[in-house]
Interface confidence: medium
Amino acid sequence: EAHKSEIAHRFKDLGEQHFKGLVLIAFSQYLQKCPYEEHIKLVQEVTDFAKTCVADENAENCDKSIHTLFGDKLCAIPKLRDNYGELADCCAKQEPERNECFLQHKDDNPNLPPFQRPEAEAMCTSFQENPTSFLGHYLHEVARRHPYFYAPELLYYAEKYNEVLTQCCTESDKAACLTPKLDAVKEKALVAAVRQRMKCSSMQRFGERAFKAWAVARMSQRFPNAEFAEITKLATDVTKINKECCHGDLLECADDRAELAKYMCENQATISSKLQACCDKPVLQKSQCLAEIEHDNIPADLPSIAADFVEDKEVCKNYAEAKDVFLGTFLYEYSRRHPDYSVSLLLRLAKKYEATLEKCCAEGDPPACYGTVLAEFQPLVEEPKNLVKTNCELYEKLGEYGFQNAVLVRYTQKAPQVSTPTLVEAARNLGRVGTKCCTLPEAQRLPCVEDYLSAILNRLCVLHEKTPVSEKVTKCCSGSLVERRPCFSALTVDETYVPKEFKAETFTFHSDICTLPDKEKQIKKQTALAELVKHKPKATEDQLKTVMGDFAQFVDKCCKAADKDNCFATEGPNLVARSKEALA
């Protein structure tokens, strides 16, 4: 229904706390360089304005769209051009072009230092002094680094953060309590960030139809007892919600997400038997719980998929009458039977089925032509199954760090032109798939591995798109979203690459490496490994093992030495010489 004042409507629906959090996220995602203090001032102004509109919907400017109100606020910031350059040009445009312009200027890799977690005591002091400001800083810091983070989900993580601090700051050993709990929240949030970026990429590049197909497959897996019309209703709503969040309509997105949770909880009987526990929770936790819900049990009496989609004499007629609905039904029926497949695989199978019908329904004997379609799915299913098997075996053999290094070598050979920091980030994330997925039961491995890899590769594509350097990466990233992972997996050593000059300074290290946290130490070593591969793309596994082992010993030895600086200065050149020799 239409409301006189959109901003008043959202304020009333969301409540002041969530309203303010969402406005802060919106501003932080649009203007990623502004300090917290500047954004919080704008948030307060917008909130005060919303309150006047709640009191009187006819008050001046209350009838303006939220994009107009937010855009006007952002464009009124002094020195906008000095800080943001051409983003200031957006302000010359009218809505909706102005908002589109802001969206295009979102930076997936902003030049911001990594978010450093303060020491436990200091954290607890500032949290206890002003919890609202502390959590506001958290929203701001995460949102500006992840401009597509799913806003209502970020509010949920802020709530989790709050819970952890409330609990741990009363403990005697605050650090022991905080570290593992905050690490767990951080890990979940980082995965959520890449997953949501993938959804926004899907929406931006391929439109709502492609996203809705993804949603139909996902919902059908989770709710196999729901009928097709129910699944499409949920998929339509989820598509709308994600479109809003990806488009910067964060208030509407969060409001609609809460509405969907309410609808699901009111209609559990026609959706799933597993929802009740989620439905007893408060709104943010309820939505998050529903998004992570375990699959319902598959109905016992499902007929073979072949009955409706291969053996039925009316297949071509049904397909011709309403292609989207017929294919949607196929995707639904196949997905509800296969919670053990990744969504990417299910979409590839649906695409194969569509291509088969397009070809066969134009021929003389369609049933004979499409009769073997299900058998033709076999190679498409085997490929990701083999990927999971080989990669999980390698992970089990090498552990996370070793597996990351193996992935780093593989991807540096595939795309040596890509910058080393991007390759290291991608390989570290891809390598985490082992820890995340390989320990799961067999039936959950494939969906976990492939859908996680797809999200990480999407991040690689997004970064590469900004500064394209590898034709092979461009080719894999330009194709369909569901074909990306197989495309990257199929890449081999780039024969066109001219090896990088051996630069001694790339492999020169100093005593500062000794005081780095383990993670930073690993990144230093992995940076050196990528550079080695760029210098010698065809180096054997043994050669790389020798050099990296030598390097690890060198760092270990010098960090234990009495005169660390002297050790690095004298042993360093010897290491470089030995490395050159080993790779010759």
Epitope: E227, F228, A229, E230, T232, K233, T236, Y263, N267, A269, T270, D308, D312, E314, N318, V325, F326, T329, Y332, E333
Partner: nanobody, 119 residues
Framework: EVQLLESGGGLVQPGGSLRLSCAAS????????MLWVRQAPGKGLEWVSV????????YYADSVKGRFTISRDNSKNTLYLQMNSLRAEDTAVYYC????????????WGQGTLVTVSS
């Protein structure tokens, strides 16, 4: 016992309009998706439109998109089909049906109402 009773059919000129109704009883209407199907003389059953239990979303066969509108009133247990810009090829017996879990198998449908489009 499930009962579906269609009405509103009749003779109409090409370009004209009709509104079909379907009164439902014997099941919980407001938790069931519903659809309209039709059967032209000498032809097989063709689905026309589907509506979710809540009223949205709705789906249409390509042949009727933009001309037909499906709607429902859950408080009256009634399903509707507004048909505009009617064509000769829309001539058929129209049935309302309770939507099952498989798209192309219909659990229950009524006795139908005949729509004839002719000048």
């Amino acid at each position: 016992e499930v009962q579906l009773l269609e009405s509103g059919g009749g003779l109409v000129q090409p370009g004209g309009s009709l509104r079909l109704s379907c009164a439902a009883s014997g099941f919980t209407f407001d938790t069931s998706s519903m659809l309209w199907v039709r059967q032209a003389p000498g032809k097989g059953l063709e689905w026309v439109s589907v509506i979710h239990q809540s009223g949205t979303p709705t789906y249409y066969a390509d042949s009727v998109k933009g001309r037909f509108t499906i709607s429902r009133d859950n408080s009256k247990n009634t399903l509707y089909l507004q048909m505009n810009s009617l064509r000769a090829e829309d001539t058929a017996v129209y049935y309302c049906a309770k939507f099952p879990s498989s798209q192309f198998r219909f659990d229950y449908w009524g006795q139908g109402t005949l729509v004839t489009v002719s000048s």
